[in-house]
């Protein structure tokens, strides 16, 4: 999700921005801090068995508008945000999870508490 | 033009504390973080840390952790770096450097020198 | 942490002739966003290190045609076609791949 205001194409930054990452470290990260020229990110989606999983991360500038977008994906719970506006900014990200379809109840597995 | 300003020299006792500034002018100072080298007389280039002037977020050289520590003045584009229980061996030059994916412009440097 | 190493240590090379130093680091520069963040500096006595090339091949603003750079992942070269006597320097590799970000030792360029 993007500030209201911000251009949809890509502006390089003049200036590198770090990011805190979680289960999404490059091997250029140090002490799970990236790098990039992009943005940060921070992920929630459903793993194989329907727990939540969160990723946080760096996204280079090339596709990262496309990824930040958060466009829906069929038969996949999965929300992303990005931001630039700090260093580790994404450590302030906490994406939820879409609620669920009617139709996803109906498709996917059962999950019991 | 870019221009980072930094004292010619400092003297300072062994054991003792300095604030070395470097003034930039030229550009948007929050636009670029800003970086410290070491240069020890005839010898080569050793990377200090960076600071980010628009969120003062810092990294450091584990080398240097507890040694130098990096801080901003915004209000007047200045960057700071304050080196803490002198020895000879923190006698040196050091230059503060414009980063934004590499050091584009470099200060004159300030030459410290540590002695009694 | 990243080694950079330069060779030769030091290079003597008469007028109008080509110098090449090489640099070699100890893991691959290439950064996860896809661009290799090496670059070289030229330092004279008395003075600040200046940017010649940055992230391998792109010449600063204001800097000569003959300086040139190229390579790759872990071995990046730096060559200066026609040696002029203002080229008189030591000239740095670094990286800012990794932190913490590391040069070169160094090497001396000299007119023979």
């Known amino acids: 999700k993007k500030e209201d205001g911000e251009s949809t194409a890509p502006t390089p930054r003049p200036k590198v921005l770090r990011c805190k990452c979680h289960h999404h470290c490059p091997e250029d990260s140090v002490n799970n801090i990236c790098s990039t020229d992009g943005y940060c990110f921070t992920m929630i989606e459903e793993d194989d068995s329907g727990l939540p999983v969160v990723t946080s991360g760096c996204l280079g500038l090339e596709g990262s508008d496309f990824q930040c977008r958060d466009t829906p994906i069929p038969h996949q719970r999965r929300s992303i945000e990005c931001c630039t506006e700090r260093n580790e900014c994404n450590k302030d990200l906490h994406p939820t999870l879409p609620p669920l379809k009617n139709r996803d109840f109906v498709d996917g597995p059962i999950h019991h508490r | 033009q870019v221009q980072l300003q930094q004292p010619g020299a400092e003297l300072v006792k062994p054991g003792a504390s300095v604030k070395l500034s470097c003034k930039a002018s030229g550009y948007t100072f929050t636009s670029y973080w800003m970086q410290w080298v070491k240069q020890r007389p005839g010898q080569g280039l050793e990377w200090i840390g960076e600071i980010d002037p628009s969120d003062q977020y810092t990294l450091y050289n584990q080398k240097f952790k507890g040694k130098a520590t990096l801080t901003v003045d915004t209000s007047s584009s200045t960057a700071y770096m304050q080196l803490s229980s002198l020895t000879s061996e923190d006698s040196a030059v050091y230059y503060c450097?414009?980063?934004?994916?590499?050091?584009?412009?470099w200060g004159l440097g300030t030459t410290l020198t540590v002695s009694s | 942490d990243i080694v950079m190493t330069q060779s030769p240590d030091s290079l003597a090379v008469s007028l109008g002739e080509r110098a090449t130093i090489n640099c070699r680091s100890s893991q691959s520069l290439v950064h996860s966003t896809g661009n290799t963040y090496l670059h070289w500096y030229q330092q004279k006595p008395g003075q600040p290190p200046k940017l010649l090339i940055y992230?391998?091949?792109n010449r600063f603003s204001g800097v000569p045609d003959r300086f040139s750079g190229s390579g790759s992942g872990t071995d990046f070269t730096l060559t200066i076609s026609s040696l002029q006597a203002e080229d008189v320097a030591v000239y740095y590799c670094s990286q800012s791949t990794h932190v913490p970000f590391t040069f070169g030792q160094g090497t001396k360029l000299e007119i023979k």
């Open positions: 450097a414009r980063f934004g994916y590499y050091v584009d412009y």
């Open positions: 992230k391998v091949s």
